[in-house]
C-alpha cells in the first residue's frame, strides 16, 4: 500500500482491543482546504514505542487504514480511497507493548465537516438569576455551533455539561454557579446540524471564583501611640487564599479576591469625614481615636461578608501639658503646637459615660501663638463643659482634616468642668483631738478627686482666733486628713479645706472652731 | 514644607547607565512608599517602579517595559531614594518623576529631572 | 493591566463653562483613582483622590464622582488658570497607570 492512500488490506498487527484505560482519544476529522483532509486525536499513557493506525470503514462495509507511526496528526487528500462525500466510520487503532488499544468511533461525512475553533479570546463571565453566564464572539465564518461545557472545582472530577444550539455573532452559556467554591470551565464547539462532526479542542481554562468571596479571616494589632501622636495598625494574619482547581493554580485572573480595608474614625464626630476605604496590603497610621476596621472580600460578582473589628482609643493621658484658664467670659484651653497650619478637633465627654455622648468642636486652621502654643476658647453661655463634672478631653490635629489617616493625637487628659473652684469645696470638715497639743483634720474627698490628675492639692488652714495668726498645710491629692500640731489648749481655732487644681485655686470650706480642753492636774 | 527634589538626569547613550536621585523633605520618609513615574516629551504620565517603606518589607515592583533594567532603592537615614537605570534606550528618554505612593497619606510630586538617551 | 481610558483627548471651553471628562478603566477599581492637573513644564498637582474628595487647598469648582469602573472629572466653572492637562490614575492594582490625557484649552 501507498503510504498517501489507504490501505485495504488487514493491519499488521493483532486485531484485539486491551481494554485499558491508556490509548487515543478525542479523534477530530474535517476538511482543511478543497481537497484536504485532517485527523488529529490524542494519546494518553506513555508513548515510548507506539504506532497509531487510523483506520476508516466505508458504508459498503469496506475497511482501511493508514500508518501514522508515532504523531498524533495525520492528513490525507480526496484521492486517498476515503469517500468523503458520504458518510464513514472512523477510529484510531494504537499497537503498543503488545497490545491494540481503540478510540471511540467517530462518524461524520468528511466533505461537509469544518474545523470548528473553541470560543477564543476574551469570554466574558457575569451572573445572571443565580447562574453564571458566559458570552464570546463566534470564531470567525463559525456561525451555527454545537457548545459544550466542562466544569471541575479544586476537590471534583470534570463534569459535562451542555450549552444547546448556538446560531449568532455571539454565543453564550449558562452554566452552574458554585457558592463557596472556585471553578475551572472550559468550552468547546462543533459544527451545528452536521452529524458527527468532530469536537473543536477545549478552551483555554476559564476560572470563576464562588458567587461568595471568602470571609476574611486575619487580625489587626496596633502599635503603641508614637511622639507624634499616631499608632500603626499592622496586619497579624494574611487573609486566607481560594483554593483553585488544577487549571486555575498560578495565574488565574478572574479568581481573585480583592481585600479592601474600611476605616471609621469613631472619635471627633464633628470632623469632615469620617470613613476611608484603603487597600489592605497598606497599613495606615491611625490616631489615638477609637476606631472600626471593616476587611471587606470582594470578587468579580461583588462583595462579601465583610469582618469588622473595634480599636480602642488609646487611653494614655497627658496630665500638665493643657493648660486651662477660666475667666469672666468664658474658657480658654493651651496646650503645644504640633505645626504651621493645624487645625484641631477638641472632643469631651463626661467621665463614666458612653462613647456616644461625645461632644467635639473643629478648630479654624491655627499657627502657633508666639509662644508655640495653640488655644480653644468657648463661652459660659456655650453650654461646653458646663456641668460641675470631670470631663475626658482629646485634642486631635491634622494638618489635612479630610484625610482619615492624618489625624494625630496631641494630648489627652480631664478636665473638671463648671465651677470648678466651688464644686470641688471639700465637704464634712471635721476635727478630732489627737494629742495634747494636735488634732487629726478629716474631710470628705473633693468632686475634683474623682478626675484623675486634676485635684493637684489639698490646702488646710489653721487659724488661732486669739493672735490671728494663720498657718497653711498642702496635702497630697490622695489623702483626705491631717495632723495640726503645735496647738494650745484653751485657744480658740478655725480650721478650712480647700482644693486646688494645677490652674485653679479652691474655694474654703466653712470655717470649723474647735479648741483643745486645759488638762487640769490632779 | 514638603519637598522631593530629583537630581542625577543629563544626556547618556544608548546603553549606558544613569542614577537619579530625589532627596525628601518635610515629612517621614521611612514611612512612606516611594514611586518613580516618567513623561517622555509631548506624551502622558508612565509608571516605572515603587519602593514599599522597610516596616512594609522595603520589596519592590516595575513596570513591563524597564524590569530588569531599572532598580528603585531607599536609604531612610539619608532621606533619599534612588533609581539606577541600566541598558538604556533611546524609548526611554523622559522627565523622571519621584513621588509617594497614591492613596497613601500625602500625594507629592519631585519637580522632575529630564533624562535623555541619545547617541 | 488596568487600562484607563480617557475621553476626550483634548477639549475647548469658555471661560464659566461647565467642563466633564471620563475615564473609564478596564476592570473594577473600586474608588482608588485620582485626577491630577498638570500645567507645561510643571508636575502634575493632585486634585481629587478616592475618586471624589478634594485635596486640600484645591478650589471646589473642582469634583469627582464615579465606582467600579465609570469616573467623572467635573470643573463647574472653567477658569482661566484651568488650562492645562489633566489626567486620571487608578491606584487599585500595579502596574499604576494613568489615562491618556485631556488638554483643556480656552475658546
Known amino acids: 500500500c501507498r503510504t498517501s492512500e489507504c490501505c485495504f488490506q488487514d493491519p499488521p498487527y493483532p486485531d484485539a482491543d486491551s481494554g485499558s484505560a491508556s490509548g487515543p482519544r478525542d479523534l477530530r476529522c474535517y476538511r482543511i482546504s478543497s481537497d484536504r483532509y485532517e485527523c488529529s486525536w490524542q494519546y494518553e499513557g506513555p508513548t515510548a514505542g507506539v504506532s497509531h493506525f487510523l483506520r476508516c470503514c466505508l458504508s459498503s462495509g469496506r475497511c482501511c487504514y493508514f500508518a501514522a507511526g508515532s504523531a498524533t496528526r495525520l492528513q490525507f487528500s480526496d484521492q486517498a480511497g476515503v469517500s468523503v462525500l458520504y458518510t464513514v466510520t472512523l477510529w484510531v487503532e494504537s499497537w503498543a507493548r503488545n497490545q491494540t488499544e481503540k478510540s471511540p468511533e467517530v462518524t461524520l461525512q468528511l466533505y461537509n465537516s469544518v474545523k470548528y475553533e473553541p470560543p477564543l479570546g476574551d469570554i466574558k463571565v457575569s451572573k445572571l438569576a443565580g447562574q453564571l453566564r458566559m458570552e464570546w464572539e463566534t470564531p470567525d465564518n463559525q456561525v451555527g455551533a454545537e457548545v459544550q461545557f466542562r466544569h471541575r472545582t479544586p476537590s471534583s472530577p470534570w463534569k459535562l455539561g451542555d450549552c444547546g444550539p448556538q446560531d449568532d455573532d455571539t454565543e453564550s452559556c449558562l452554566c452552574p454557579l458554585e457558592m463557596n467554591v472556585a471553578q475551572e470551565f472550559q468550552l468547546r464547539r462543533r459544527q451545528l446540524g452536521s452529524q458527527g462532526s468532530s469536537w473543536s479542542k477545549w478552551s483555554s481554562p476559564v476560572c470563576v471564583p464562588p458567587e461568595n468571596p471568602p470571609q476574611p479571616q486575619v487580625r489587626f494589632s496596633v502599635e503603641q501611640l508614637g511622639q507624634d501622636g499616631r499608632r500603626r495598625l499592622t496586619l497579624k494574619e494574611q487573609p486566607t487564599q481560594l483554593e483553585l482547581p488544577e487549571g486555575c493554580q498560578g495565574l488565574a485572573p478572574g479568581t481573585e479576591v480583592t481585600y479592601r480595608l474600611q476605616l471609621h474614625m469613631l472619635s471627633c464626630p464633628c470632623k469632615a469625614k469620617a470613613t476611608r476605604t484603603l487597600h489592605l496590603g497598606k497599613m495606615p497610621y491611625l490616631s489615638g481615636a477609637a476606631y472600626n476596621v471593616a476587611v471587606i472580600s470582594s470578587n468579580q460578582f461583588g462583595p462579601g461578608l465583610n469582618q469588622t473589628w473595634h480599636i480602642p482609643a488609646d487611653t494614655h493621658t497627658e496630665p500638665v501639658a493643657l493648660n486651662i484658664s477660666v475667666g469672666t467670659n468664658g474658657t480658654t484651653m493651651y496646650w503645644p503646637a504640633r505645626a504651621q497650619s493645624m487645625t484641631y478637633c477638641i472632643e469631651w465627654q463626661p467621665v463614666g459615660q458612653d462613647g456616644g455622648l461625645a461632644t467635639c468642636s473643629l478648630t479654624a486652621p491655627q499657627d502657633p501663638d508666639p509662644a508655640g502654643m495653640a488655644t480653644y476658647s468657648w463661652s459660659r453661655e456655650s453650654g461646653a463643659m458646663g456641668q460641675e463634672k470631670c470631663y475626658y478631653i482629646t485634642i486631635f490635629a491634622s494638618a489635612h482634616p479630610e484625610k482619615l489617616t492624618l489625624w494625630s493625637t496631641v494630648l489627652s487628659t480631664y478636665h473638671f468642668g463648671g465651677n470648678a473652684s466651688a464644686a470641688g469645696t471639700p465637704h464634712h470638715v471635721s476635727v478630732k483631738n489627737h494629742s495634747l497639743d494636735s488634732v487629726s483634720v478629716d474631710w470628705a474627698p473633693s468632686l475634683l478627686s474623682t478626675c484623675p490628675g486634676v485635684l493637684k492639692e489639698y490646702v488646710v488652714r489653721c487659724r488661732d482666733e486669739d493672735s490671728k495668726q494663720v498657718s497653711e498645710h498642702p496635702v497630697q491629692p490622695t489623702e483626705t486628713q491631717v495632723t495640726l500640731s503645735g496647738l494650745r489648749a484653751g485657744v480658740a481655732y478655725t480650721v478650712q479645706v480647700r482644693a486646688d487644681t494645677a490652674w485653679l485655686r479652691g474655694v474654703w470650706s466653712q470655717p470649723q472652731r474647735f479648741s483643745i480642753e486645759v488638762q487640769v492636774s490632779d | 514644607e514638603v519637598q522631593l527634589v530629583e537630581s542625577g538626569g543629563g544626556l547618556v547613550k544608548p546603553g549606558g547607565s544613569l542614577r537619579l536621585s530625589c532627596a525628601a523633605s518635610?515629612?517621614?520618609?521611612?514611612?512612606?512608599?516611594m514611586n518613580w513615574v516618567r513623561q517622555a516629551p509631548g506624551k502622558g504620565l508612565e509608571w516605572v517602579g515603587r519602593?514599599?517603606?522597610?516596616?512594609?518589607?522595603?520589596?519592590?515592583d516595575y513596570a513591563a517595559p524597564v524590569k530588569g533594567r531599572f532598580t528603585v532603592s531607599r536609604d531612610d537615614p539619608k532621606n533619599t531614594l534612588y533609581l539606577q537605570m541600566n541598558s538604556l534606550k533611546t524609548e526611554d528618554t523622559a522627565v523622571y518623576y519621584c513621588?509617594?505612593?497614591?492613596?497613601?497619606?500625602?500625594?507629592?510630586w519631585g519637580q522632575g529631572i529630564l533624562v535623555t538617551v541619545s547617541s | 493591566d488596568i487600562q484607563m481610558t480617557q475621553s476626550p483627548s483634548s477639549l475647548s471651553a469658555s471661560v464659566g463653562d461647565r467642563v466633564t471628562i471620563t475615564c473609564q478603566a478596564s476592570?473594577?477599581?473600586?474608588?482608588?483613582l485620582n485626577w491630577y492637573q498638570q500645567k507645561p513644564g510643571k508636575a502634575p498637582n493632585l486634585l481629587i483622590y478616592?475618586?471624589?474628595d478634594l485635596e486640600t487647598g484645591v478650589p471646589s469648582r473642582f469634583s469627582g464622582s464615579g465606582s467600579g469602573t465609570d469616573f467623572t472629572f467635573t470643573i463647574s466653572s472653567l477658569q482661566p488658570e484651568d488650562i492645562a492637562t489633566y489626567y486620571c490614575?487608578?491606584?487599585?492594582?500595579?502596574?499604576?497607570?494613568f489615562g491618556g490625557g485631556t488638554k483643556v484649552e480656552i475658546k
Open positions: 513621588t509617594t505612593d497614591p492613596g497613601w497619606e500625602f500625594d507629592y
Open positions: 519602593i514599599k517603606s522597610k516596616t512594609d518589607g522595603g520589596t519592590t
Open positions: 518635610g515629612f517621614t520618609f521611612s514611612n512612606a512608599w
Open positions: 476592570q473594577d477599581i473600586s474608588n482608588f
Open positions: 478616592d475618586a471624589s
Open positions: 490614575q487608578q491606584y487599585d492594582n500595579l502596574p499604576l497607570t
